[in-house]
Amino acid sequence: QTWYDSLGAINKIQDFLQKQEYKTLEYNLTTTEVVMENVTAFWEEGFGELFEKAKQNNNNRKTSNGDDSLFFSNFSLLGTPVLKDINFKIERGQLLAVAGSTGAGKTSLLMVIMGELEPSEGKIKHSGRISFCSQFSWIMPGTIKENIIFGVSYDEYRYRSVIKACQLEEDISKFAEKDNIVLGEGGITLSGGQRARISLARAVYKDADLYLLDSPFGYLDVLTEKEIFESCVCKLMANKTRILVTSKMEHLKKADKILILHEGSSYFYGTFSELQNLQPDFSSKLMGCDSFDQFSAERRNSILTETLHRFSLEGDAPVSWTETKKQSFKQTGEFGEKRKNSILNPINSIRKFSIVQKTPLQMNGIEEDSDEPLERRLSLVPDSEQGEAILPRISVISTGPTLQARRRQSVLNLMTHSVNQGQNIHRKTTASTRKVSLAPQANLTELDIYSRRLSQETGLEISEEINEEDLKECFFDDMESIPAVTTWNTYLRYITVHKS
């Protein structure tokens, strides 16, 4: 074991020593705008080149029936770009709000801007002075002050302004040592909200031309988030160029430009008023619920994902990468008969039930389009959302056989709060049983009605209670046929967990 550990350490040292010598970067202060033109990117290294070659080969040899797409039938799953033909331009001092479905490529977009992910095609322009706030807040061992200044020269006025805008004054005043209180190893432990605010403060304190804020308000309550968005993002940073990944309507309304991503493509780019004019059905769906912004981030993302899936299927969105033919949104009768009523109606079910998890697939796998009939998926909310989500959400997606398994597994992961990282998707695991509860039907609030909206066209009867065995049947798959695919989500989780 020691020998293997030593080898690992030697390899890491070797990798480090072989890297390009670090040089302090210069900045182009004459570049004021941030531009992205026709950007397409793959997470798999070198995949862009491979894809181009395959495309060329495809042009050279036509298939027997003249259908080019057949050549890509097995290729497209692994070759789906994480970003496809993305365009935007924002001037200095503007706020671009980036929203979109789960796994749509929002974080990947920021990675591309930072140069962490190299596109296979396109153009990116900015001054180079970037500050990034990750959705995963982090703290270094040291004082609060050190964690915020983080090596940047100290400016009292700037520091105080940032502390105030990020609502850290009250937290700091509680400690005898004030902002000299030590965090991390041997120090105090912070709450998730405090960590999030310190991480945001760190990003804001650094002087930059472009601020990339990746869902920075994690763990913050609705009121605090609203206040910090106003005081920090809108006021303190008013003259800075900002790109904010968000799922809040309030943020979209306040943004100068909006970019909505769906499955790696740009579903919409423009202003909020243009969104209302050009995509009235889509925007009214999301704004139809006054309490949309009161939902948890997970719930908002889920609703956004469902809505985008629905509208892209109805042909409102740009054609997806594999250019699937439009299919009816209505569910086939055959599918309704295949599933027992107990699965389709969890509303009356008050009792707890268990779900056997068969495989530890990661959530948010690439979703592939397919010509198979659409199926409705049972999607249950996690325990943490019981208060606001009594009804299960029904998600409508177009999936190939491979992704049916993924989507089912992601539902299981959602139900069981499962976070199994870095495991092989082929491995047959020992079944682990977790308990999930469905809250009883109380009075139907606007939230409940809203959660039904997406499935109002469905012709399914809602009755009985959930039968555990029936549910297990829904999620059974032959895992042998699934190819291994590493997505950005998996990669990001991996580096987050193993960052030491």
Partner: nanobody, 127 residues
């Protein structure tokens, strides 16, 4: 204004090698893209190779893949184009171009994407 200065051109026999240099400055070498283009007599200017200077990632035209190598020296602020196995059809005036944007894929081999150009250096491959 970005300054670009090419050098290293000359007369070489088929199968021989040459190394072209493009000296630049400032930001371009950190966040932009440097491209090499060539123009043979009576022909249009075409993209040969390019490099994203922040990451060192590269692209090549099909006609030079495996023979030409573009690389950078961040200390000397210089981009090099190492040309091996030269053929008579490689005879052309070679130009260094720069842009403050990062250009990827086919974008970085397109002339119209570049804002700054050098004066050019002549390469002649002949026996």
């Amino acid at each position: 204004q970005v300054q670009l200065q090419e050098s290293g051109g000359g007369l070489v026999q088929p199968g021989g090698s040459l190394r072209l240099s493009c000296a630049t400055s400032r930001f371009t070498l950190d966040y932009g893209t440097i491209g090499w283009f060539r123009q043979a007599p009576g022909k249009e200017r075409e993209g040969v190779s390019c490099i994203r200077t922040s990451s060192g990632s590269t692209n090549y035209a099909d006609s030079v893949k495996g023979r030409f190598t573009i690389y950078r020296d961040i200390v000397k602020n210089t981009i090099y184009l190492q040309m091996n196995s030269l053929k008579p059809e490689d005879t052309a005036a070679y130009y260094c171009a720069a842009d403050e944007a990062r250009l990827y894929g086919s974008s970085c081999l397109r002339m119209d994407e570049y804002d700054y150009w050098g004066q050019g250096t002549q390469v002649t491959v002949s026996s």
